[in-house]
Amino acid sequence: ECVTQLLKDTCFEGGDITTVFTPSAKYCQVVCTYHPRCLLFTFTAESPSEDPTRWFTCVLKDSVTETLPRVNRTAAISGYSFKQCSHQISACNKDIYVDLDMKGINYNSSVAKSAQECQERCTDDVHCHFFTYATRQFPSLEHRNICLLKHTQTGTPTRITKLDKVVSGFSLKSCALSNLACIRDIFPNTVFADSNIDSVMAPDAFVCGRICTHHPGCLFFTFFSQEWPKESQRNLCLLKTSESGLPSTRIKKSKALSGFSLQSCRHSIPVFCHSSFYHDTDFLGEELDIVAAKSHEACQKLCTNAVRCQFFTYTPAQASCNEGKGKCYLKLSSNGSPTKILHGRGGISGYTLRLCKMDNECTTKIKPRIVGGTASVRGEWPWQVTLHTTSPTQRHLCGGSIIGNQWILTAAHCFYGVESPKILRVYSGILNQSEIKEDTSFFGVQEIIIHDQYKMAESGYDIALLKLETTVNYTDSQRPICLPSKGDRNVIYTDCWVTGWGYRKLRDKIQNTLQKAKIPLVTNEECQKRYRGHKITHKMICAGYREGGKDACKGDSGGPLSCKHNEVWHLVGITSWGEGCAQRERPGVYTNVVEYVDWILEKTQAV
C-alpha cells in the first residue's frame, strides 16, 4: 500500500538497517526509496528537546510485515518509502538548505558569486555529491563566498550541523542538469585498473553499468563475464573511482568488459530497470518466498508485486508436474544484487520491475516499428500529438511531443495569432485525423510558454511548451519521448525520423494518416552553405537528403525529429522551417533540443 504522507512526532520502533544524515524528512524519504531494502524511516528534526547530535538523522528501516510499531516522540518524523507506490519517482533535489552545514570530504574549495553558481559547479564536477556555500554575511572574512564541494561514500552527508550564514544543497546530476559527458560505450576485453570502492554480482556488463550509475561513488566499472578464467571472479562487477574521474590504466584482458557511470545520461536511458531474463542462470540470495508460477514472466510479475523482492529465479516445471507450473523463488540481499550467480542449472532469473518507475518513463521500449512505407502504424510514435485549434473551425494546427505527463514540446511559430490557450486542444494516441470526432477526448491547454527570445522561426528560439490542464496517463499509444542529455552533445545520430500529418508537397492539404520519413542529419556547416541568406546557429539542427524528396512540410511544424540511440528514442529536433518542402539541397531546419534542455527543465520543474 502506498502511503505518501509523513507522520509527525512519530517514531518507528526497530527494524533499523542503517543511519544516514539528510537535511529534511522529505529527502530522507527519497533516500529510503532508493535504498535496496528500506521500506520505512524515522527522521529527527532539529528541536530543543532533542540532542543536537541526533538532529537530521535519517534511520532507514525494514520489516517483513512492511510496517513497524509506532511510538510518540517529539521532533521525530516517520514515513514509508515510495517503493510501495506506482507513481514516477525522482532523486532530483533542487532545495537549498539555509543555515545548514552538510559535512563530507571537502575536496574542492573555490570562490563563487552565489549559491546557484556553487550548485552548478557541484553538478558539473564528477565527484561532487553536495556542497556548502558561505554567504557574504558569513562572519569569517576569509571564508565568505567560498564554495566547498563535498563527497562521501554514501552520497549523503556524514553529519549535518546548524551554521549561520551558510547554505547547502545537492548536485543536480539526477535532475539531468549536468554538462558532464555521457559515455555510453562498453569496452570489450578491457580492465580498468583503479581502486575498487565496491563489488557486486551482475549477470552482464549492462546491469553492472546500471549499478555503477546509481552507486554514489562509482565513476566507472569493470565486469568479469562468465567466461572469465578465474572462477571466483566470474560475474563480478567492480565499481571503481579515481582522483581524475577517469581510469588511469586500461589493461587488455579477454572476457572482461569495462565502461563508465551513466550518471550524466540518466534521464535518457534506463538505470534502475533491469528488464532482461537470464536463461540457464540462477541468482542466489536470501529467500523471501517460493511460489508456483506458469512462466518466468509470471514469476517476474510476482517479484515486482512483492515489495521486498529484489530478484528471482524460476525453475520450469518438470513434465506433467504441478499443473505445468514451475517454482518461482523470490529473493533479496543487502545490496539488491545476487550474492552469487550460477550457470548451467536450468533456472531463468531476473530482477523486479518495481524500480523501473525510478527511471524516466521515456526510456520504456516501444513496440517494433514497420520498416519502409510512409504511413505510420498505431503506437509507432506514441509521443506524437496533434495540436488542434478551434478557430475559425476545429483543425490540425501543429505537431508536438509528449515530454512529461503535463507537458507538450512544440514550436513557438505555431502560436502566431493564437489569442488564448483555451482555444487549443491536444489529441494524443491518434493515428488518423479522421478518428477525431466531436466526442473524442482531448487535453485542454492551461498555458502556452514561448521562449522569450523567439521572434521568428528563421532566427531561432522556435520552441514552446504547452502545459496541459490534466495529466496524461501513459499507455502504449501515448507516452513521453526522452530529451537528449546535455552530455550527449557529441553523439552522431544515424536513425532519425520526422513525423507529422503535414502536407506531402508544397500545395497540398493535411494528411489523414500520420506520415513518417527517415531523414539523415546534416552538419551545420553543410546546412549553412544551403542557406546563405540565413544564420544557421548551434541552436538549430538540419536534416534532409541532398537530392531532396523527403522532408517535413506545412502542418508538421512543432512535431518531433526523433532519433533512436542505444535502443532509446530521443527528441533531437522540433520541426521549424525550411525553404519549400523536400527541395534539392534545401534541408529542413529544426530547433536543436539539446541546447534548450535547461530552459525546458526550468519551465517544467518550476514550483
Epitope: 478557430s391 475559425p392 473551425t393 476545429q394 466531436e438
Partner: antibody, heavy 117, light 107 residues
Framework: QVQLVQSGSELKKPGASVKLSCKAS????????MHWVKQAPGQGLEWIGN????????NYDEKFRTRATLTADTSTSTAYMELSSLRSEDTAVYYC??????????WGQGTTVTVSS | NIVMTQSPSSLSASVGDRVTITCKAS??????VSWFQQKPGQAPKLLIY???NRYTGVPDRFSGSGSATDFTLTISSLQAEDVADYHC?????????FGQGTKLEIK
C-alpha cells in the same frame, strides 16, 4: 438537445444602441465559439464576429470592429452582441450560431432589428 | 478577405431534376467550405461541412464536392420541399465569408 434562443425584435432610432442576447442550452457553452451573422432584407449572410466564452477571445470583421461588441456570461450561458451608432443599413435579422466541430451547426431563430426615425 | 462567388443567383428546376450550385473561392480554402439551406422566414440550416460531408439528418440526395477554390452542391433528385435559398461559406480564415446565395424554385 442543443438550443439557441434569441431575444425578441427591436425597433431603434438612428444613433442608438441595441444589445441582443442568445441563450444557449444543451451543450458546454464555454467550449464552443459563438458567431454572429447579419442578414439584411433580401440579402445574403454577412459574418460579424465570434467569441470564445471560456476566454473571451473575440474576432471581428473589420466592417463591424468599431461598432459591434461581443460578450458572454458563462454563469447564464448567454452570448450578447451590442451594436452602437445604429443606422438604417443595420436593419436586418441577426443570428447567433454555434461553431460546432467543423461548421456552424446550430442557429438561433434570429432577432429582427429595425432602425427607423 | 476571401470572396466566395456563388452561381447561379437563382435557378428554376423541376421535381426529380439534378441540380448543381457552384461556389468559387478567391483563394485556396482547402476543404473548409459549408453549405446551408434557408427556407423563407427561417434560420439557415447546415447541410454539408468540410466540402463533402453530409450533416446528420440531411437526406442523401444532397452531396458536396470540391477542394481548394471550386466547390459544388448537388441535389441528385429535386423534391418540392427543397425550395429555399442556399448559401456557401468558408471557415478557412478570418473574416468568415459567405456567397451571395442561390434562390432555388420549382418550375
Amino acid at each position: 438537445q442543443v438550443q439557441l434562443v434569441q431575444s425578441g425584435s427591436e425597433l431603434k432610432k438612428p444613433g442608438a444602441s441595441v444589445k441582443l442576447s442568445c441563450k444557449a442550452s444543451g451543450y458546454t457553452f464555454t467550449r464552443y465559439w459563438m458567431h454572429w451573422v447579419k442578414q439584411a432584407p433580401g440579402q445574403g449572410l454577412e459574418w460579424i464576429g465570434n467569441i470564445y466564452p471560456d476566454s473571451d477571445s473575440t474576432n471581428y470583421d473589420e466592417k463591424f470592429r468599431t461598432r459591434a461588441t461581443l460578450t458572454a456570461d458563462t454563469s447564464t450561458s448567454t452570448a450578447y452582441m451590442e451594436l452602437s451608432s445604429l443606422r438604417s443599413e443595420d436593419t436586418a435579422v441577426y443570428y447567433c450560431t454555434r461553431m460546432g466541430f467543423y461548421a456552424m451547426d446550430y442557429w438561433g431563430q434570429g432577432t429582427t432589428v429595425t432602425v427607423s426615425s | 478577405n476571401i470572396v466566395m462567388t456563388q452561381s447561379p443567383s437563382s435557378l428554376s428546376a423541376s421535381v426529380g431534376d439534378r441540380v448543381t450550385i457552384t461556389c468559387k473561392a478567391s483563394e485556396n480554402v482547402v476543404t473548409y467550405v459549408s453549405w446551408f439551406q434557408q427556407k423563407p422566414g427561417q434560420a439557415p440550416k447546415l447541410l454539408i461541412y468540410g466540402a463533402s460531408n453530409r450533416y446528420t439528418g440531411v437526406p442523401d440526395r444532397f452531396s458536396g464536392s470540391g477542394s481548394a477554390t471550386d466547390f459544388t452542391l448537388t441535389i441528385s433528385s429535386l423534391q418540392a420541399e427543397d425550395v429555399a435559398d442556399y448559401h456557401c461559406g468558408q471557415s478557412y480564415s478570418y473574416p468568415l465569408t459567405f456567397g451571395q446565395g442561390t434562390k432555388l424554385e420549382i418550375k
